[in-house]
C-alpha cells in the first residue's frame, strides 16, 4: 500500500515532501507566490491528497494558474495603458492609468502606476486597490490670453476659447405674468458646478427677502462665444441653486451663489473651470490687472433707463473682455462714501476700474469672473464676481465696479461643493 | 475636531495687566479668525475683538481699544488677548470664539472661557 | 453701533409649550443674525446662523425666523434641557453686538 511517486505541479510545490508515501499520509499541493491552486476549474489556496489503502492518491495532483486581475476597473475622465505586452493581466503585470490631459490631471499628483498583486487585485503603492481621482483642470485656456488688451464697456471681441470657463446664465419665470427674463454670467469650477454673484439667483421681488430663484428656471449656457449661435454650447439645467445664506439685497454684501448642473459638462478646449484662490481676507493687491468678460451692455453711452426700456436688445452678440486695474480700497470706499445714496463697500468687496472711466463692466455682465493671472501657479484664478456699480451709467469718470471677493468665500464655496478644501488644495501655512 | 483650549482662572491686582491664551487646533490655524468675547457674571455678552493670524489683522469695538491687546503666535496656533490697567469692572469670562467660515462672524466654536478676577 | 433689543429679560414656560424669544435690530441688518444658547457655566453655543439656518446637531424644535430689523427664535415644544440664557447676535457690521438675554425657565 505504498502510492506512487507525486511531481509538484509547475509554479507549486507539495509538503511534506518525501521519498515514499503509505497510507494515511497526506500532502498539501500549493503554488508559488502569484499562482492560485486550479482544482476542476475551481481556484483555491492550497489543496490537500491522501494516500489511501490500495495504494492511489485520492485524488490527482491539481495545476498552478497565473493569478489574474482582469480588467482594471474604468477611470472616470481618464484612460488606463498596459505596460505589459499583449494587455496581460496577470501576476506582476503593470498598467497605468492616466487623466484626459489637458483637461483633466491626477490628485496629488498621483504616479497612477497599478500592480496585479499575488492576490488579484490591482494595487497602487500610495493608493492600495482605490482608484485614482481626476480633477478638472482649472484656469489654463487652450487659447492664451494676450498680454495686452484695449480697453466690457470700452473691451473687445473674445475669441473662442479664450474664457473656457465664461457661462451664460439665463433665467426665465414663467409663473410670472408677464414673464421675467433676465440673464448673468458665471464661471465654471469644475464640472458640475458655476459661480456666480447671488443678485444673478435671487427672484426678482419688491420686498427685501432673499429667495432664489426655481431650479427648473435657471439655463446654464458653456462653451458659448455668440450669443446669436448657441448650436455649438452645452447648455444644461440646474439642479441646485445656493445663494450664499447672508447675501443682503440692500448692500450686496455676500453677493455670491453657486449653480450645480443637472448633469456634469464635457470639459474641451471651450469649456474649461477656473482656478479658485486661497482662503485670504488681502484678495486681489491694489493695482494688480484682472480680466472680465461678459455679454453685458458695451456701449458706454446707455443708461440704465434705457436699457430697461430696450430689453436686451443692447446687449452685446459677441463675449466682450475688458482689462481693469483692482482699486485701493480706501479709494474706492471714499469714492462711493461721497455719492449720495446708502453705498457700502465692505470688506467682502474690492474694486476695479479706472479713474478715468471709459472701461467698466455693465448690466448683464453680473456674476462673471474677475480673474487674475498667478505667476506662481500659471493659471488664471477668480477673484472677482461682477456685482454693483454707482448709479451713473457705466464706465463714468470715478465710478469704480464693485466685484465680490471671492477668496473670503472659498471655505464656502468648497463646502457647498461638498469637498474639503485640504483635499483639493492642501492649506500652506505662511 | 475644532477646538480652542483657554485656562480657566487667572486672579490680577488691580492696576495690574493679564495676558490670557487660547490654543488652537484641528483646522488651520492661519485661515479664520479668532473673536474675544467678555461676559460679566449674570450679564450679556460682549464684542471685544478679532484677529486674523494670518496676517495679525485685528477689528476692535471702540469701547476695548485702549483696553484689550490682541496677538497671536502661529507657531504655537495660540491666540492671546492682553488686558491692561485692570479694575473691578473687567472681572469677567473672556471667551475667545471662531468663525465657522471665514466671511461671517457668527461664532460655531468657542472656547471653555477664562474667567478673570481682578481683586487685591 | 446696531443695538439689538430683547425686551424680555425672563420667560416662564412649561415642557411641551411653543416659546417665541423675540429680538430687534437698531437697523436693517438683513439676515446677518445668530442665535445662541448658555447653560450655566458653560459657553455659549451656536443654535442659529443667517437668521433662520438651524446649525449642525442642534434639534428641530429650533426655529429661527426674520429679517432686517425683527427675528424670532421659536423652540415648538420646549424641553427640560432647553432652560438656559438665550442671545441674539448682529454680524451684518462692525461692531459686533449681542442682545442682553433671555432667560428661560420653567414654571
Known amino acids: 500500500n505504498e502510492c506512487p511517486e507525486l511531481q509538484p505541479p509547475v509554479h507549486g510545490k507539495i509538503e511534506p515532501s518525501q521519498a515514499k508515501y503509505f497510507f494515511k499520509d497526506q500532502v498539501l499541493v500549493s503554488c508559488d507566490t502569484g499562482y492560485k491552486v486550479l482544482k476542476d476549474n475551481v481556484e483555491m489556496d492550497t489543496f490537500q491528497i491522501e494516500c489511501l489503502k490500495d495504494g492511489t492518491w485520492s485524488n490527482k495532483i491539481p495545476t498552478c494558474k497565473i493569478v489574474d486581475c482582469r480588467a482594471p476597473g474604468e477611470l472616470e475622465h481618464g484612460l488606463i495603458t498596459f505596460s505589459t505586452r499583449n494587455n496581460l493581466t496577470t501576476y506582476k503585470s503593470e498598467i497605468k492609468y492616466s487623466c484626459q490631459e489637458p483637461y483633466y490631471k491626477m490628485l496629488n499628483n498621483n504616479t497612477g502606476i497599478y500592480t496585479c498583486s499575488a492576490q488579484g487585485v490591482w494595487m497602487n503603492k500610495v493608493l492600495g486597490r482605490s482608484l485614482p481621482t481626476c480633477l478638472p483642470e482649472c484656469g489654463q485656456p487652450s487659447r492664451s490670453l494676450p498680454s495686452l488688451v484695449k480697453r466690457i464697456i470700452g473691451g473687445r471681441n473674445a475669441e473662442p476659447g479664450l474664457f473656457p470657463w465664461q457661462a451664460l446664465i439665463v433665467v426665465e419665470d414663467t409663473s410670472r405674468v408677464p414673464n421675467d427674463k433676465w440673464f448673468g454670467s458665471g464661471a465654471l469650477l469644475s464640472a458640475s458646478w458655476i459661480l456666480t454673484a447671488a443678485h444673478v439667483l435671487r427672484s426678482q421681488r419688491r420686498d427685501t427677502t432673499v429667495i432664489p430663484v426655481s431650479k427648473e428656471h435657471v439655463t446654464v449656457y458653456l462653451g458659448l462665444h455668440d450669443v446669436r449661435d448657441k448650436s455649438g454650447a452645452v447648455n444644461s439645467s440646474a439642479a441646485r441653486v445656493v445663494l450664499h445664506p447672508d447675501f443682503n439685497i440692500q448692500n450686496y454684501n455676500h453677493d455670491i451663489a453657486l449653480v450645480q448642473l443637472q448633469e456634469p459638462v464635457p470639459l474641451g478646449p471651450h469649456v474649461m473651470p477656473v482656478c479658485l484662490p486661497r482662503l485670504e481676507p488681502e484678495g486681489p493687491a491694489p493695482h494688480m490687472l484682472g480680466l472680465v468678460a461678459g455679454w453685458g451692455i458695451s456701449n458706454p453711452n446707455v443708461t440704465v433707463d434705457e436699457i430697461i426700456s430696450s430689453g436686451t436688445r443692447t446687449l452685446s452678440d459677441v463675449l466682450q473682455y475688458v482689462k481693469l486695474p483692482v482699486v485701493p480700497h480706501a479709494e474706492c470706499k471714499t469714492s462711493y462714501e461721497s455719492r449720495s445714496g446708502n453705498y457700502s463697500v465692505t470688506e467682502n468687496m474690492f474694486c476695479a476700474g479706472y479713474y478715468e472711466g471709459g472701461k467698466d463692466t455693465c448690466l448683464g455682465d453680473s456674476g462673471g469672473a474677475f480673474v487674475i493671472f498667478d505667476d506662481l501657479s500659471q493659471r488664471w484664478v477668480v477673484q472677482g464676481l461682477v456685482s454693483w456699480g454707482g448709479p451713473e451709467e457705466c464706465g463714468s469718470k470715478q465710478v469704480y465696479g464693485v466685484y465680490t471677493k471671492v477668496s473670503n468665500y472659498v471655505d464656502w464655496v468648497w463646502e457647498q461643493m461638498g469637498l474639503p478644501q485640504s483635499v483639493v488644495e492642501p492649506q500652506v501655512e505662511r | 475636531e475644532v477646538q480652542l483650549q483657554q485656562p480657566g482662572a487667572e486672579l490680577v491686582k488691580p492696576g495690574a495687566s493679564v495676558k490670557m491664551s487660547c490654543k488652537a487646533s484641528?483646522?488651520?490655524?492661519?485661515?479664520?479668525?479668532i473673536t474675544w468675547v467678555k461676559q460679566r457674571p449674570g450679564q450679556g455678552l460682549e464684542w471685544i475683538g478679532d484677529?486674523?493670524?494670518?496676517?495679525?489683522?485685528?477689528n476692535y469695538n471702540e469701547k476695548f481699544k485702549s483696553k484689550a491687546t490682541l496677538t497671536v503666535d502661529t507657531s504655537s496656533s495660540t491666540a492671546y488677548m492682553q488686558l491692561s490697567s485692570l479694575t473691578s469692572e473687567d472681572s469677567a469670562v473672556y471667551y475667545c470664539?471662531?468663525?465657522?467660515?471665514?466671511?461671517?462672524?457668527?461664532?460655531?466654536?468657542w472656547g471653555q472661557g477664562t474667567l478673570v478676577t481682578v481683586s487685591s | 453701533d446696531i443695538v439689538m433689543t430683547q425686551s424680555q429679560k425672563f420667560m416662564s414656560t412649561s415642557v411641551g409649550d411653543r416659546v417665541s424669544i423675540t429680538c430687534k435690530a437698531s437697523?436693517?441688518?438683513?439676515?446677518?443674525v445668530a442665535w445662541y444658547q448658555q447653560k450655566p457655566g458653560q459657553s455659549p453655543k451656536l443654535l442659529i446662523s443667517?437668521?433662520?439656518n438651524r446649525y449642525t446637531g442642534v434639534p428641530d424644535r429650533f426655529t429661527g425666523s426674520g429679517s432686517g430689523t425683527d427675528f424670532t427664535l421659536t423652540i415648538s415644544n420646549m424641553q427640560s434641557e432647553d432652560v438656559a440664557d438665550y442671545f441674539c447676535?448682529?454680524?451684518?457690521?462692525?461692531?459686533?453686538?449681542f442682545g442682553a438675554g433671555t432667560k428661560l425657565e420653567l414654571k
Open positions: 437697523q436693517n441688518v438683513g439676515t446677518a
Open positions: 447676535q448682529q454680524y451684518n457690521s462692525y461692531p459686533l453686538t
Open positions: 470664539a471662531r468663525r465657522r467660515y471665514y466671511a461671517t462672524a457668527w461664532f460655531a466654536y
Open positions: 484641528g483646522y488651520t490655524f492661519t485661515s479664520y479668525w
Open positions: 443667517s437668521a433662520s
Open positions: 484677529i486674523y493670524p494670518g496676517s495679525g489683522s485685528t
